[in-house]
């Protein structure tokens, strides 16, 4: 059977010989060289050779633990003469020894840490790891522990574990952000001659809200013009604030002042300044300075840090307003007017008022803006402001007239305004009415005394304020003798009656009838108009058949005596 | 490189004996065996024995225990192979063969001995 | 004495067929693992050279389309791939005790 037990190797074995192992040895062994010994496994023939006659191994090379602990290797032995194994194959172990040849080395070569500033003393930053590659299960060489050597007295390390915590009671981030705190770590329990390695921690302080906005000056002043419409941004203030990011953060707000309805504060996100804008249009004339009380806050306040006072601020922002030179202005926005349409030229309207706002009070003159007036139907009395006609009207040519009128300050005529005029043309009965069509109709030869056969419409270009009321009759050359009669229905409206029984188409083939249409408004006004009748054969139900088409072919033929 | 050379060819009478030689170099002559095998026309191939040249110790098979010898001359390091009373079944070539773990891993070129009377 | 039994005697085979030849001991030649047979190829006129040394094991320099395989009595010997230089006689051989013993011999040819 084989004789060895485990073999043990110190590692990094400095001599100049090679590092004797140990023997195998196998109790077949007579010592007369006839076994060989073979060795194969893990650094055979590299690492470790072996004397083939006598069992003796040898280490080659200088062996590092921490690259590989254990070698496991065969050995067999073996008659020389016949290749027979003399000893089964068998495993064997050589555990490599360990020295303290490895310093601790730090998982990052710096690490990065951030801890909110005004920490409670024994908060938590980070947690730093140093590895030592020796061996942890013999002896103290790899057995760390982590010292602080720079970042006192703002930082500790806990020697065992490696937490990093606070030290110092209100580091404050406004005052030092940044620490470089270096730990080291040191194997051997941390004892004399133990190696050691170190590693850099960059601390930063993140900020929390322990500052307040505060205004650089306690009064604004700014100008803006009267003219300046709502939105419009007059100045910018600006609170500071020692904090940083959200905690940083500045909204404004007007608390006071006679001003408060008449200006506003934006904040500008990007720059973190409030910007004061017109809220209502500003009148020079009326008021010319505003003061404003203006508070600069923090939207996100800490209640741990309320002890140290209100985390706002507040500043008087004082407001003058501008004068500016005003065009004039109109005492209406717009004018509406009337006149009869039979006004003579020259005949006044009424008139338009314009004045200047300014102080100055400047004097003001009227013009018809003639884009709007093309044909120069009105005119203005530069001076008063006076609305005349310079042409004769019809209201039933157009009802209204839109014009312009500008006034425009005499010292500046830079300074204008307009208004719109709106001139209605009222009636007057200065048209006849008349036949709403040709009227042509046909009578037929066996008609019955009083048959309806026409209904007569008339129409009237006036416009009479109580509606139109016509009234119809036979013109009076031919009321006398008259083959038909016209009756009056006193809705506007006439029918033409037949006033016999028959009509023979061969003694009158036509009948023309003149008709007087007449309106009872003041001027009465009235014309005459003519129906043409027919006389045609019909059915018996009174339906056409035939007429004389020499009535229609010559007129000149036709009798008038209706 | 290793090389076994052998003695040239030999015709014997009957009864006779003869003594082939093999000259070993290249290696280290006293580690490694060195066997005999011979090799009758057209016939396959038979181990005779072997000799441990530090030691001279030796092995033979029952076949010719009686007829052969093997020794070797360290100093020349030549192994020698020595068969007596030659009869003609005996003709063949003979073979030294440098054994290492049963295997027989280099050879000589051969000596061929032929036995008539 | 360790009989050792090789078959076939002879055969012929094709450039690139597979060629297989046994060799059957009359006992065991394997102990602890290790199988002491080994086997040779002889051309003529010339010495046997060793191709397997302990059942499967590729001398230095012999081609790899020679291999061994096998324990105990059971062993074969394969080209994977005939090539005209290997027409020769194979032999087995034991050393697992003396006397050591060889198998008759196989004659491959081409056919």
């Known amino acids: 059977s084989w004789m060895w037990n485990q073999f043990f190797l110190l590692e990094e074995y400095t001599g100049s010989d090679y590092q004797y192992v140990g023997k195998l040895h196998s109790d077949q062994d007579r010592g007369d060289g006839s076994l060989k010994y073979i060795l194969s496994g893990d650094g055979a023939g590299d690492l470790f050779i072996i004397n083939e006659n006598t069992g003796d191994i040898q280490a080659t090379k200088r062996l590092d633990r921490e690259e590989k602990p254990v070698y496991i290797l065969r050995a067999q032995a073996i008659n020389r003469r016949t290749g027979r194994p003399v000893e089964p194959e068998s495993e064997f172990i050589i555990k490599i020894h360990d020295i303290n040849d490895n310093e601790p080395i730090f998982t990052k070569e710096v690490y990065t840490a951030t801890v909110p500033e005004m920490s409670d003393v024994g908060t938590f930053v980070v947690q730093v790891t140093a590895t030592d590659a020796d061996d942890p299960t013999y002896g103290n060489s790899a057995k760390v522990v982590y010292s602080i050597l720079q970042g006192q007295p703002y930082f500790s390390v806990e020697s065992e574990t490696g937490i990093i915590k606070t030290a110092l009671l209100n580091m404050d981030r406004e005052n030092r952000e940044q620490y470089q705190v270096v730990i080291q770590a040191k194997d051997m329990g941390g004892q004399m001659g133990g190696l050691s390695g170190t590693t850099t921690v960059n601390i930063t302080l993140t900020d929390v809200n322990d500052n307040p906005p505060r205004f650089p000056q306690s009064t604004y002043q700014f100008k803006t013009p009267e003219s300046s419409p709502p939105g419009t941004p007059i100045g910018r203030i600006k609170a500071s604030d020692a904090d940083v990011g959200e905690n940083a953060e500045i909204e404004y707000s007007i608390t006071d002042g006679e001003g408060l309805d008449m200006f506003d504060v934006i904040t500008d996100q990007e720059t973190q300044e409030g910007i004061i804008t017109v809220k209502k249009l500003l009148d020079f004339e009326k008021k010319k300075v505003y003061t404003l009380k203006v508070e600069a806050s923090n939207p996100y306040v800490e209640p741990r840090f309320l002890y140290l006072g209100p985390f706002k601020d507040s500043a008087t922002v004082r407001i003058v307003v501008e004068d500016v030179d005003e065009p004039p202005v109109f005492s209406k926005l717009a004018y509406i007017l009337q006149i009869r349409e039979d006004a003579q030229i020259n005949t006044t309207i009424g008139s338009v008022t314009a004045q200047d706002p300014d102080a100055a009070r400047n004097p003001v003159k009227y013009s018809v803006d003639r884009h709007t007036d093309m044909d120069r139907i009105f005119n203005i009395d530069s001076g008063n402001g006076s609305i005349f006609t310079s042409k004769l009207l019809d209201r039933e040519t157009l009802l209204w007239h839109n014009i312009t009128v500008i006034a425009t300050e005499i010292n500046n005529p830079k300074q204008s305004s307009r208004v719109p005029l709106y001139i209605k043309v009222l009636d007057v009965n200065d048209n006849a009415p008349e036949f709403a069509e040709f009227y042509e109709t046909f009578v037929c030869e066996k008609a019955k005394a009083d048959q309806l056969i026409q209904t007569l419409h008339a129409v009237d270009k006036d416009d009479p304020y109580s509606g139109h009321q016509f009234s119809f009759s036979l013109a009076p050359e031919a009321a006398s003798g008259s083959n038909f009669t016209i009756q009056d229905n006193k809705d506007n409206t006439a029918g033409i009656l037949t006033r016999k029984n028959g009509y023979n188409r061969h003694e009158m083939s036509t009948y023309l009838l003149p008709v007087v249409i007449s309106d009872n408004d003041y001027p009465v006004q009235s014309s005459t108009g003519t129906v043409t009748v027919r006389v045609c054969a019909c059915d018996h139900h009174g339906n056409m058949q035939s007429c004389h088409a020499e009535a229609l072919i010559h007129p000149t033929g036709l009798s008038t005596g209706a | 490189e290793v090389q076994l050379v052998q003695s040239g060819a030999e015709v014997k009478k009957p009864g006779s004996s003869v003594k082939v030689s093999c000259k070993a170099s290249?290696?280290?002559?006293?580690?490694?065996?060195m066997h005999w095998v011979r090799q009758a026309p057209g016939q396959g191939l038979e181990w005779m024995g072997d000799?441990?040249?530090?030691?001279?110790?030796?092995h033979y098979t029952q076949k010719f225990k009686d007829r052969v010898t093997l020794t070797v001359d360290k100093s020349t390091s030549t192994a020698y192979m020595e068969l007596s009373s030659l009869r003609s079944e005996d003709t063949a070539v003979y073979y030294c063969?440098?054994?290492?773990?049963?295997?027989?891993?280099?050879w000589g070129q051969g000596t061929t001995v032929t036995v008539s009377s | 004495d360790i009989q050792m039994t090789q078959s076939p005697s002879s055969l012929s085979a094709s450039v690139g067929d597979r060629v297989t030849i046994t060799c059957r001991a009359s006992?065991?030649?394997?102990?602890?693992?290790?199988?002491?047979m080994h086997w040779y190829q002889q051309k003529p006129g010339k010495p046997p050279k060793l191709l397997i040394y302990?059942?499967?094991n590729l001398e230095s320099g012999v081609p790899s389309r020679f291999s061994g395989s096998g324990s105990e009595t059971d062993f074969t010997f394969t080209i994977s791939s005939l090539q005209p230089e290997d027409i020769a006689t194979y032999y087995c051989?034991?050393?697992?005790?003396?006397?050591?013993?060889f198998g008759g011999g196989t004659k491959v040819e081409i056919k």
């Open positions: 063969a440098r054994g290492d773990l049963g295997r027989f891993d280099y």
């Open positions: 290249g290696y280290t002559f006293t580690n490694y065996w």
């Open positions: 000799i441990d040249p530090s030691h001279s110790e030796t």
């Open positions: 006992e065991s030649v394997s102990i602890h693992g290790t199988h002491l």
């Open positions: 302990a059942a499967s």
């Open positions: 051989q034991q050393s697992f005790e003396d006397p050591w013993t």
